[in-house]
Interface confidence: medium
């Protein structure tokens, strides 16, 4: 399908101008190449009538221009004078008119109305107001007002001064006369429809001194306009339908098939399960505007779209109404990331987010998305540090890769964190984007002992078993805090060779402490990664206790992944108090996280990857 | 968490205006929905506006419709409410609130991180 997108249909009358503006995938070739409009024939040929290289042909001399937007992606087509001969199919496109690159429009030029002499015109929106004003003479002050509705031959009586109101008007129309000395009286129209289109006279007083006005009503269905989004990128619909239905319940729907339209969402709680995790309806304004944003946009989203007020939360005749035409770009600038990322309890996920490369100092922010009142999406953690607290020790964003993506991991996960979550920065509004995590059955890849207790002043060993599926990875082993995970420094990983096999011994990386201190209570991540793309993380909490018994801290690495319960003893290894089963959040609560800063000179930190065998003693 | 200082409150006298200020340390409040409440002595905490993190979006109580502006300025770190027409009814301390809510519908429940109040007294 062409991703060149402009309005199906476009309407005029005789004599007026109309401007139309096609889009198109603002790519440097597509910005500079040649831009036309064009006239189908009957033959199927299309004929150019205007090109943005100057081209005008004679039909449309002196009263069309095509005018190029580059930095928008856009042109537009103005065209002038307009005759009945005007109407018919064109093309607005790119580049050579047979290549395909180009929309369809249908131009209508019809016959304006005959209308009598002196009628003034009223143009309206359909589920408007409209004040129609009635002059009138002194000697028809104290008589009858009156508007009528002329339906072919006869008038049709709609309101008067004596109180009488024609059904179909019933609620929403009221006829002021004013104080003395002003000579016009007004009828209000509420809510119009599409069949209060038509001629009107207002009356005041009878027989040949009356006074007499005509007012053409035009009621107009809201011309959708035009919204070019692209795949996986994100739309917000803006709505602003007046002080009138601030109070009234919003709703924003899909036209269908049918012609009928299909809620979307709307303030009364109903929400279509195909925008689950991708909607949010924003609260209204004090003027009774509100908006919706939808993330993760996909083709089937393509459509015409309303949104109005009603106190059923749905499309009514005679409500106030805006509408909207959304076209989907395939030819996205958001480039494809998982929209599914799936992990096991007790596992990590690692999620990649788009984001507009050009805006790299951007904040970025990621949020868990609300099904709860019209959606909503608490932040979760930004690019400069956690928000929510109860994620202390297993969230993180980290600006990496950069040049357009950054990454939040993750782990520790639970059953909780299955949903919807959202990448945001505060730049490029279109760049939202949606991820699902999904839990799924299995055993985390990484294995790290429960929470670990240091003392004071001693060394610490903590090992990390992964299987040989990460052997060709980076292993890395990092300090958590809440503005990201200091990576530690690493000590010679032993020799490349203990990989190749990967026998049971040799894969292990471990994470020295020598000597312990305050500072080094916390959490800690072992993590595995290619390059700037991170992978699996397993969380680990160190409590620094003071000194008790002499001898060194050492976390037997045949027995990390021991049982929560289980006490490991080993020759020349003290008891382990494995405090897996306590939520490691409820003690590391409230506790200032230090820097890490001077863990950068020495080898007080250090990271060791190698065989077991190398690590002084087995427990096999 | 976000740090908040709010300042501008003072005597003023009905029909006056005041401008209150919430500055942010600690943290930016970019992400952040900020909102001002009130809290009249021997009365409950009442919610009198709020502001999603564009400034795009904006809520009143009903009772200042009209009458109260909020606004931000997320460079300076900084929310503003400017309160014209002030009633004797509008005496209160006024705090100055932030919740971590990206959009959507926000209750009073979600603000986590509040200010310590600036009292604004309207004479009769």
């Known amino acids: 399908k062409s991703p060149v997108f402009g309005p199906q249909e476009v309407s005029s009358v005789e004599g007026n101008s109309v401007s139309i503006k096609c889009y198109y995938p603002p790519t440097s070739v597509n910005r500079h190449t040649r831009k036309y409009w064009c006239r189908k024939g009957a033959s199927g040929r299309c004929i150019t009538l205007v090109s943005s290289e100057g081209y005008v042909s004679s039909n449309y001399a002196g009263r069309a221009n095509l005018t190029n937007f580059p930095e928008n992606g856009t042109f537009v087509v103005n065209i002038a004078q307009l005759s009945r001969d005007d109407s018919g199919h064109y093309k607005c496109g790119l580049g050579i008119n047979s290549r395909g690159l180009s929309f369809d429009v249908s131009l209508e030029v019809s016959q304006g109305p005959e209308l009598p002499n002196g009628t003034e015109v009223y143009t309206v929106d359909v589920g408007r107001t409209v004040t129609i004003k009635c002059p009138f003479k002194t000697e028809n002050a104290p008589k009858t007002k009156a508007l009528y509705k002329k339906i072919g031959q006869t008038s049709v009586l709609v309101i008067d001064s004596r109180n009488y109101v024609n059904p179909n008007y019933k609620d929403r129309i009221r006829l002021r006369i004013p104080g003395t000395g002003q000579l016009i009286f007004t009828v209000v129209i509420d809510r119009l429809r599409l069949s209060d289109h038509g001629l009107y006279l207002c009356q005041a007083g009878d027989g040949s001194n009356r006074d007499e006005k005509n007012a053409d009503l035009q009621v107009l269905e809201p011309e959708p306009e035009l919204v070019y989004e692209d795949l996986r990128g994100s739309v917000t619909f803006h709505c602003a339908l007046g002080l009138e239905v601030a109070n009234v319940a919003k709703f924003l729907c899909r036209v269908n098939s049918r012609e009928t339209c299909d809620v979307v969402i709307n303030t009364l709680g109903k929400r279509d399960s195909a925008f689950e995790g991708r909607i949010l309806l924003n609260p209204q304004d004090k003027d009774g505007s509100f908006s919706v944003v939808i993330t993760g946009l996909r083709k089937e989203d393509e459509g015409r779209y309303l949104c109005g007020a009603h106190s059923d939360g749905q499309l009514q005749e005679g409500w106030p109404i805006q509408a909207w035409q959304l076209f989907v770009n395939e030819e996205s600038t958001i480039p494809r990331s998982p929209t599914v990322v799936k992990g096991v309890a007790g596992g990590s996920v690692a999620v990649l987010c788009p984001y507009n490369p050009k805006e790299s100092q951007s904040l970025k922010y990621w949020c868990l998305w609300e099904g709860a009142q019209n959606g909503r999406c608490p932040l979760l953690v930004e690019s400069q540090g956690l928000v929510q607290e109860q994620y202390e020790g297993r969230l993180s964003l980290l600006q990496e890769p950069g040049n357009g993506t950054f990454t939040v991991i993750l782990n520790q996960l639970t059953t909780q964190d299955a949903g919807f979550y959202w990448c945001l920065t505060n730049g490029d509004t279109r760049w939202r984007t949606t991820v699902e995590i999904k839990i799924i059955e299995g055993e985390p890849n990484l294995k790290v002992p429960g929470n670990v207790t240091a003392v004071l002043g001693e060394t610490l060993n903590i090992p990390c078993h992964f299987p040989c599926k990460f052997s060709s990875y980076e292993k890395y082993w990092c300090k958590w805090s809440n503005t990201g995970c200091q990576t530690l420094p690493s000590q010679d990983e032993g020799p490349s060779e203990a990989f190749v096999n990967c026998d049971e011994n040799s894969r292990l990386v471990s994470l020295t402490l020598n000597p312990v201190t305050r500072a080094d209570e916390g959490w800690y991540w072992c993590g595995v990664k290619q390059g700037h793309f991170y992978g699996e993380t397993a969380a680990v909490y160190v409590a620094v206790e003071e000194k008790k018994v002499a001898g060194s801290r050492y976390v037997s690495p045949a027995k990390a992944d021991a049982a929560p319960d289980e006490k490991v003893l080993d020759s020349g290894v003290r008891e382990i108090e494995n405090k897996a089963i306590q939520d490691p959040r409820l003690f590391a609560e409230e506790k200032v996280v230090a820097d890490t800063g001077d863990q950068a000179g020495g080898s007080r930190a250090s990271v060791d990857s190698s065989s077991s065998e190398e690590q002084g003693g087995s427990s096999k | 968490q976000v740090q908040l200082v709010e300042s501008g409150g003072g005597l003023v006298q009905a029909g006056g205006s005041l401008r209150l200020s919430c500055a942010a340390s600690?943290?930016?409040?970019?992400?952040?929905?900020m909102g001002w409440f009130r809290q009249a002595p021997g009365k409950e905490r009442e919610f009198v506006a709020r502001?999603?993190?564009?400034?795009?979006?904006?809520d009143y109580a009903d009772s200042v419709k009209g009458r109260f502006t909020i606004s931000r300025d997320n460079a300076k770190t900084t929310v503003y409410l400017q309160t014209n027409s002030l009633k004797p009814e509008d005496t209160a301390v006024y705090y100055c609130?932030?919740?971590?809510?990206?959009?959507?519908?926000?209750?009073?429940?979600?603000?986590?991180?509040w200010g310590q109040g600036t009292q604004v007294t309207v004479s009769s």
């Open positions: 502001i999603d993190w564009s400034g795009s979006s904006t």
């Open positions: 600690g943290r930016t409040i970019n992400g952040y929905v």
């Open positions: 609130a932030g919740s971590a809510y990206y959009s959507g519908y926000v209750t009073h429940r979600d603000f986590g991180s």
